[in-house]
Amino acid sequence: QQQTLPKPFIWAEPHFMVPKEKQVTICCQGNYGAVEYQLHFEGSLFAVDRPKPPERINKVKFYIPDMNSRMAGQYSCIYRVGELWSEPSNLLDLVVTEMYDTPTLSVHPGPEVISGEKVTFYCRLDTATSMFLLLKEGRSSHVQRGYGKVQAEFPLGPVTTAHRGTYRCFGSYNNHAWSFPSEPVKLLVTGDIENTSLAPEDPTFPADTWGTYLLTTETGLQKDHALWDHTAQNLLR
């Protein structure tokens, strides 16, 4: 006999990175017929939603109108059909950004390099932080961590055309509180014609997601669709 229902899916719209004082929606998708959804934050009950009519709804949205550092952290959700509860969803890491200061991102030997050259990014922030994050626009949400008192270095090693793209960095005050993003640095990698034409970009941040994040930053607009990637949920784990 089944003791629990399948776990729901959880995600943030428009983005799991939320500028402070901006809004975010946390979505939880379970099953039709669920009479109650619960959103948990860092192990404590955060909010409840009882969809009406439950048989016609399989997703609820929890609105956070005013993001701040107290609400940054790990979220999960569960749902109930009758008296039977689901397994908890995966954890959603909600990050507050635009805290305190803006780091400076630079690249050595420069933004235009030849395939095979060793490239290192440097992220500098003079305020009290020791963790830095380097992100590249693209599809798979890979984030590199670096450590240092005021500066972290991110050696990419010998680069290929797959490293081409736009990079930004953040200073991190804790896992879920990040600085303003740095100004972007565009890395151009040239190789021989054959390699260049055959080597596709290997972007490492969800497509269109950075644009959505910037839209949120600049205007506070809320897009009513998911722009997330499963790997983004593992960002801080």
């Epitope: 934050f41 404590s44 009950l45 955060f46 909010a47 409840v48 939603d49 009882r50 969809p51 009406k52 609820v60 949205k61 929890f62 609105y63 956070i64 109108p65 005013d66 701040n68 107290r70 609400m71």
Partner: nanobody, 126 residues
Framework: EVQLVESGGGEVQPGGSLRLSCAAS????????MGWFRQAPGKEREFVAA???????YYADSVKGRFTISRDNAKNTVYLQMSSLRAEDTAVYYC????????????????????WGQGTLVTVKP
């Protein structure tokens, strides 16, 4: 900007009743989820009850069956009817709002609330 003003606190004997009111200014009340929290001397602020825009309610286990939260959108007011009061209910009671929000959202965690009242004192003693 939303302003919340609580009233109705006072001293009552164990087993007695009180009704707290929270009047909200502005035209945003209908789009707000509302909640009551309390803080006893020397203790942390704790959740008491909450109500969604659509009228769904949620209660702390300690007050379930004794307290009732309700709202009157025409009067921009949320109420907390408290009965069978106990000494451990003694606290400053705060009204809070999440503005704006979705219709069925009920918020339990204090961090979710972006507007707070100044509080009203409830004392339960013989």
């Amino acid at each position: 900007e939303v302003q919340l003003v609580e009233s109705g606190g006072g001293e009552v004997q164990p087993g007695g009743s009180l009704r707290l009111s929270c009047a909200a200014s502005g035209r945003t009340f209908a789009s707000a989820a509302m909640g009551w929290f309390r803080q006893a001397p020397g203790k942390e602020r704790e959740f008491v009850a909450a109500i969604s825009r659509s009228g769904d309610t949620y209660y702390a286990d300690s007050v379930k069956g004794r307290f009732t939260i309700s709202r009157d959108n025409a009067k921009n007011t949320v109420y907390l009817q408290m009965s069978s009061l106990r000494a451990e209910d003694t606290a400053v009671y705060y009204c809070a709002a999440v503005v704006p929000t979705y219709g069925n959202n009920i918020y339990v965690h204090s961090a979710a609330y972006n507007y707070w009242g100044q509080g009203t004192l409830v004392t339960v003693k013989p």
